[in-house]
Amino acid sequence: KNLKSPQKVEVDIIDDNFILRWNRSDESVGNVTFSFDYQKTGMDNWIKLSGCQNITSTKCNFSSLKLNVYEEIKLRIRAEKENTSSWYEVDSFTPFRKAQIGPPEVHLEAEDKAIVIHISPGTKDSVMWALDGLSFTYSLVIWKNSSGVEERIENIYSRHKIYKLSPETTYCLKVKAALLTSWKIGVYSPVHCIKTTVENELPPPENIEVSVQNQNYVLKWDYTYANMTFQVQWLHAFLKRNPGNHLYKWKQIPDCENVKTTQCVFPQNVFQKGIYLLRVQASDGNNTSFWSEEIKFDTEIQAFLLPPVFNIRSLSDSFHIYIGAPKQSGNTPVIQDYPLIYEIIFWENTSNAERKIIEKKTDVTVPNLKPLTVYCVKARAHTMDEKLNKSSVFSDAVCEKTKPGNTSK
């Protein structure tokens, strides 16, 4: 009886694993084996595919074959018993184009209200992604084990920290890789779960802000308790993108080591131009907090984020404030080509009760003022990128008297 050639050959490539699957054409014929040949582009001869010769099952692995993953190859298969079937040719393909990114490896560390996720490619020193290893980004899905409500986090790198979690709570997550340059989305990792720890006695510092004063940076933060010492560390932000490196060498800011106030001042020349991450830790001598959330600090934006200038037009029950570009020395306006948001603080001159308005517009109305009353106004600018979280210092306060009644029109 003539053997029929196998059909429906599928090539699955995940990372550096090359798997072939096919259907038997004739289930009734026993003791059939299958063999593959391959042919590279521009070659006439067929070569036996090692790992896929005389196979009794309908699956084989040819990962050991050292192929150029960017070069098109063609495969053919036949069935063998006493005689052989005709060859069945598989559509030619380029391994790199066909390849899927496998599930990444995930390593978790827990704090009381945070989880640190270390992600690395599932295949170490992969041939398939050798030229793209630096381009991997990851996304994850995380949920509380008890609720199952999922949150997605996109575009993260090989180390990511998730904050604002609940203590003593089990969180589960899965991660997948992507190569955006090649439009490839990977396969999710298995689900990993970890329980956050009991709440630490000392919370981490919060609301870290950097501003510029004279030739210095001023770093400020909030803290719950008094009589603490703090230390501040920095890291080049680009190191977060290094896929093979989970060992981050955070550096001390010398003027911010063991400070006893919730701020520290250090010269601008501590940092060269660039983007940095900053973090703060608190200690009371016996206990040490976990590190604060890391804030992004861009020296370029920081250096040029000057307080806004503004004019006030006074009415009886309101001020109209017109915000303009800040002036450099020499009275030339500074061009700030990133979106800003303005925080305007105003108060009655005879009172300490401040009120605040936050506006994206450069013309702002301050309503509900009393006639013939002196009010003071100060303003500062913030970048709208939450991660950068940059703020200028406040402008000098400007005080104006509202007009007498009935001039609000």
């Epitope: 390593h107 978790l108 560390e109 009381d112 720890t197 060992l247 550096k251 200690s283 016996n286």
Partner: antibody, heavy 119, light 107 residues
């Protein structure tokens, strides 16, 4: 293969100083922190401090701040521990170690150097 | 400094048994804890890091668990070659600190 090779045993008199070396192979010390840990006979392990050989930045346990000085020479891929004003209390084995791919723990250790202080 | 306390200085067990070595931190250290094995005259060897991750080549009879302040190294199906000192270590913050050690003796 990652290896840390430490210098040989030192027998010194009280008041003297000693400089121990730890030569790395299989990796570049500039890429990792190198730590020093001490252990007295039949006792536990104590962390002395660490160095970042890339820029020489050091951290010490308060107890060893005035006793130990850690340095590194990237060109010879070697870290050093200098111990000063030695007394019999400083008699111990001193280990160098290297962090893994995650900060803070030590998968790689040198074989240890015995420092014996005796009149 | 964060004190790490291994309350049992000695533990006696038999081949095939299961034994748990415990370690308590004076404050929460998250899961930033490692375990080491040290045999007489040798350097310490890493067994566990990040509380529960087994280091390469470590037999799966060694498992780590716990979080916050209480940590455990469990050796199931104890073998004669497991006779050694076992140390925990925190790396939540400097100065890094070790427990005093637990000597495992085989009956």
């Amino acid at each position: 293969e990652v290896q840390l090779q430490q210098s040989g045993a030192e027998f010194v008199k009280p008041g003297a100083s000693v400089k121990l070396s730890c030569t790395a192979s299989g990796f570049n010390i500039k890429d990792y922190y190198i730590h020093w840990v001490t252990q007295k006979t039949e006792q536990g392990l104590e962390w002395i401090g660490r160095i970042d050989p890339e820029d020489g930045e050091t951290k010490y346990a308060p107890k060893f701040q005035d006793k130990a000085t850690i340095t590194a020479d990237s060109s010879s891929n070697t870290a050093y521990l200098q111990l000063s004003s030695l007394t019999s209390v400083d008699t111990a084995v001193y280990f160098c170690s290297r962090e893994g791919s995650f900060t803070g723990w030590f998968p790689y250790w040198g074989q240890g150097t015995l420092v014996s202080v005796s009149a | 400094d964060i004190v790490m306390t291994q309350s049992q200085k000695f533990m006696s067990t038999s081949v095939g048994d299961r034994v748990s070595v415990t370690c308590k931190a004076r404050q929460s250290v998250g899961t930033y804890v490692a375990w080491y094995q040290q045999k007489p005259g040798q350097s310490p060897k890493a067994l566990i890091y990040s509380t529960s991750y087994r280091y390469n080549g470590v037999p799966d009879r060694f498992t780590g668990s716990g979080s916050g302040t209480d940590f455990t190294l469990t050796i199931s199906n104890v073998q004669s070659e497991d006779l050694a000192d076992y140390f925990c270590q925190q790396y939540h913050s400097y100065p890094y600190t070790f427990g005093g050690g637990t000597k495992l003796e085989i009956k």
